[in-house]
Every structure is written in structure tokens, then in C-alpha cells.
């Protein structure tokens, strides 16, 4: 009988034991849920505010048919600025055009007045080759006015209605590119 | 905590062609670019190639024309496709995601060794 009651009460305690078991797996999962729960409503909120607020372009951004601009207020030198931009999501301005040359070169006026900023150019030190960061030439209408007599490496800014260039390690403020994004409507 | 995984690495011949690959994980909703640096050993880390969340890549002058960055499918992935290798482009080439919360994070580095 003794033994039979000392069974039972190790069988009990076994159930007891997974019972525990589950019970802190289930508020582990419980937790676990929350935070996920959390992160969703933290990004749901996210989405729900850039959709509320879905401008083509960013705050301090100027947009111009299919792209978005930033004019920087800092001065950096080229491949620092190229980075400034990365971090924006965008790359350095790329000038496709004469028409987007006139807006950028007219915007800045209108903003800043005459300093140097620098663009996505930059020249091949074996070839002489201008390029712009994608790889990409610029059309022949779009190259730098004047050569560089710098030894060190040579890069492409915008200064009032020209293109010119410089040491890419001179400081200068700088323009950023990205897409506009396009409205859902 | 964002995780950044290169892959990819190894030793080449002089002329050969590598794939890096980088995969970010972790607490990371957005990625505004993601890149390649990479140093070599007695030089400054440097910037190969990068790309924006919308596609839009920048790449130096000595990877021009011989390397491709691109995104993968999940957007989380970026890929690094070396062509033409000279023995210059030795080095350790560090994945590097640019987030929206303005932070830069960094993956370990794979080591490219080109052989001649």
C-alpha cells in the first residue's frame, strides 16, 4: 500500500514537474509574441506615418520630374561626400541632361548662390577618362570645362552654370540624387 | 542586433572572377545602401561599391567597368561580382549596410587573395 501511495506521488510530481515545464515555455512564447508584437506595431507605425506623409521626396529635398535632390550645408571632400550620400539612401548628383543641368544650376542660385558642389564625376587616372560613378560617360556636352593640373585624383563639381574640375581632396558642399517616389494614387 | 554575413571569398588567379555575397539578419527594417569596402594590408579601408535601396550604384574608379554590385531578391542581400582580378585587388573586402537609423554597420570581412 505504502509503496503503491509512493508511486502516485512520484508520478504526481512528475506531471507537476512538465506542467512547470509548459507553463514557462508558454511565457516564453507569451514574451516572445509581445516583442514580435511590438516590433510589427513599430513598423506598422512607420509605414503608416512616410504613407501619410508620402511627398515624392524628403523633407529639405527638391524634386524635379523623376528625381529628388539634396544640397548639402556641410563641406566635405568627394569621396566623404559620396558616403554623406549613401547614407541618405541616395548617390551623388548623375546629370543626364542639359534640362536637368538648367534646373540644378538655377536651383542653386535661387538657394545658395555661386559656390562649388560636387557631383558623381570623376576621372580615370590611367585613361584620363571622365566617368560618371555608375560607370557610366557623360554625354560630350556635359564634361568638365577645364582639366586639373592635380596630380592627385581628379573629380567633377558644379559651380554657378558650369561644370568644372578639382583635387577630389579639396572640401566643397556637395548634391545628392535619389529617385521621387512615385504617388499610389 | 543587425548580423552581416560575407561569403564568398578565396583565392583567385590573376584574371579570375569571385562572387561576395552579404546577407544582414537581426532587428533591421530598413536599409536605405549597402556596399563593399575593403583594405588591404598597410592601407585605409576603402570604398569598392555601393547601392541604394532603389538600385542606383556608385562604384571607385579602380572597380569600374570590372565589378558589378547588386541587390538580391530579398533586399537584404547584397552581391559583388569581381571580374578581370589583378594582384592589386587583394585584400579584406568588408560588407557594409548604411540603415535608416542613421547607423553604419559592418560584417567581418572575407579575405580575396589574386595570385599571379
Known amino acids: 500500500k505504502l509503496l503503491q501511495v509512493s508511486t502516485i506521488a512520484m508520478q504526481q510530481q512528475e506531471k507537476l514537474i512538465q506542467q512547470e515545464r509548459a507553463l514557462l515555455n508558454f511565457t516564453e512564447w507569451k514574451r516572445s509574441c509581445a516583442l514580435q508584437m511590438k516590433y510589427c506595431q513599430a513598423f506598422m507605425q512607420n509605414s503608416l506615418s512616410s504613407a501619410h506623409n508620402s511627398s515624392p521626396c524628403p523633407n529639405n529635398w527638391i524634386q524635379n520630374r523623376e528625381s529628388c535632390y539634396y544640397v548639402s550645408e556641410i563641406w566635405s571632400i568627394w569621396h566623404t561626400s559620396q558616403e554623406n550620400c549613401l547614407k541618405e539612401g541616395s548617390t551623388l548628383l548623375q546629370i543626364e541632361s542639359k534640362e536637368e543641368m538648367d534646373f540644378i544650376t538655377g536651383s542653386l542660385r535661387k538657394i545658395k548662390g555661386s559656390y562649388d558642389y560636387w557631383v558623381g564625376l570623376s576621372q580615370d587616372g590611367h585613361s584620363g577618362r571622365w566617368l560618371w560613378q555608375d560607370g557610366s560617360s557623360p554625354s560630350p556636352g556635359l564634361l568638365p570645362a577645364e582639366r586639373s593640373q592635380s596630380a592627385n585624383q581628379v573629380c567633377g563639381y558644379v559651380k554657378s552654370n558650369s561644370l568644372l574640375s578639382s583635387n577630389c581632396s579639396t572640401w566643397k558642399y556637395f548634391i545628392c540624387e535619389k529617385y521621387a517616389l512615385r504617388s499610389s494614387v | 542586433q543587425v548580423q552581416l554575413q560575407e561569403s564568398g571569398g578565396g583565392l583567385v588567379q590573376t584574371g579570375g572572377s569571385l562572387r561576395l555575397s552579404c546577407a544582414a539578419s537581426?532587428?533591421?527594417?530598413?536599409?536605405?545602401?549597402m556596399g563593399w569596402y575593403r583594405q588591404a594590408p598597410g592601407k585605409q579601408r576603402e570604398l569598392v561599391a555601393a547601392?541604394?535601396?532603389?538600385?542606383?550604384?556608385t562604384y571607385a574608379d579602380s572597380a569600374k567597368g570590372r565589378f558589378t554590385i547588386s541587390l538580391g531578391n530579398a533586399r537584404n542581400t547584397v552581391n559583388l561580382q569581381m571580374s578581370s582580378l589583378k594582384t592589386e585587388d587583394t585584400a579584406v573586402y568588408y560588407c557594409?549596410?548604411?540603415?535608416?537609423?542613421?547607423?553604419?554597420?559592418w560584417g567581418q570581412g572575407t579575405q580575396v587573395t589574386v595570385s599571379s
Open positions: 557594409t549596410i548604411w540603415a535608416r537609423d542613421r547607423q553604419q554597420y
Open positions: 537581426g532587428s533591421i527594417f530598413s536599409i536605405n545602401s
Open positions: 547601392i541604394t535601396s532603389q538600385g542606383r550604384s
